[in-house]
Interface confidence: medium
């Protein structure tokens, strides 16, 4: 898991396309000492991938998450 | 420059094991999410397995779980393929490959492989 | 698992275009890369996330991706065009994440 590192987990990049919306149940926000900003979309299985916040796909899945 | 270089393939008879090892130059390697994928003579591309870039997360195919084992050491910059209970049907090209975009810890970002090593040849026979 | 059903082969003359079909249940959903492998050589990545092309990769490479199929197109097919294809895409939160396509046979009459 991301978080047993002892330094900060970051993205360095983005997935291009967005995930397929059922397979995702949750979602949290790296650092804020990243260089690069990004959401981490957590899947059924726990994979964890990195997405851009600024995409309007992830946004809309971000708030699909929070009403559901 | 990128390289991956694979070693350890050869001729083993069935029911046998091999390490396969790929070593890995150019890049920060525990970036990076590593796969190895193979293809028998004459066939297709088949993926075998799969490692996060801290080695947290590991896939496999069916068609080789339980009998192979995907591990790696960042230290080393080095991948590997425990090879266990092989069968005739193993025979063929291993590739090691890097998964493109992904990152450390075990995030994902990419998906597709953008360095491939030239392979060694696994030859399961009696 | 999912499955990538590829043409075992397409012939095209040179100057032509060449299309490699993918086909796979709603593609078009998925993230998907193409491969070039020539005889006794490995792989090399030509199409990446459906449309991107790797930096050294020629701009006679093109690729889409809608529906059920997805195409990988080769304008202006040289003779060093004539390779083995594969499609593969990444099915997130698949047991079996990676999968290729059978791979097609480009041949360059």
């Known amino acids: 898991s991301p978080y047993s590192s002892d330094t900060t987990p970051c993205c360095f990049a983005y997935i291009a396309r967005p995930l397929p919306r059922a397979h995702i149940k949750e979602y949290f926000y790296t650092s804020g000492k990243c260089s690069n900003p990004a959401v981490v979309f957590v899947t059924r299985k726990n994979r964890q991938v990195c997405a851009n916040p600024e995409k309007k796909w992830v946004r809309e899945y971000i708030n699909s998450l929070e009403m559901s | 420059e990128v390289q991956l270089l694979e070693s350890g393939g050869g001729l083993v008879q069935p029911g046998g094991s091999l390490r396969l090892s790929c070593a890995a130059s150019?890049?920060?390697?525990?970036?990076?999410?590593m796969s190895w994928v193979r293809q028998a003579p004459g066939k297709g591309l088949e993926w075998v397995s799969a490692?996060?870039?801290?080695?947290?997360?590991?896939y496999y195919a069916d068609s080789v779980k339980g009998r192979f084992t995907i591990s790696r050491d960042n230290s080393k910059n080095t991948l590997y393929l425990q090879m266990n209970s092989l069968r005739a049907e193993d025979t063929a090209v291993y590739y090691c490959?890097?998964?493109?975009?992904?990152?450390?810890?075990?995030?994902?970002?990419?998906?597709?492989?953008?360095?491939w090593g030239q392979g060694t040849m696994v030859t399961v026979s009696s | 698992s999912y499955v990538l059903t590829q043409p075992p082969s397409v012939s095209v003359a040179p100057g032509k275009t060449a299309s490699i079909s993918c086909g796979g249940d709603n593609i078009g959903g998925q993230n998907v890369h193409w491969y070039q492998q020539k005889p006794g050589q490995a792989p090399v990545l030509v199409i990446y996330?459906?449309?991107d092309r790797p930096s050294g990769i020629p701009e006679r490479f093109s690729g889409s991706n809608s529906g059920n199929t997805a195409t990988l197109s080769i304008s202006r097919v040289e003779a060093a065009d004539e390779a083995d294809y594969y499609c593969?895409?990444?099915?997130?939160?698949?047991?079996?994440?990676?999968?290729f396509g059978g791979g097609t046979k480009l041949t360059v009459l």
């Open positions: 490959a890097r998964v493109r975009g992904s990152s450390q810890y075990d995030f994902w970002s990419g998906s597709e492989f953008d360095y």
């Open positions: 593969q895409v990444w099915d997130v939160d698949s047991d079996h994440p990676w999968v």
């Open positions: 996330y459906d449309t």
């Open positions: 490692i996060s870039g801290s080695g947290g997360s590991t």
């Open positions: 150019g890049f920060t390697f525990s970036s990076y999410a």
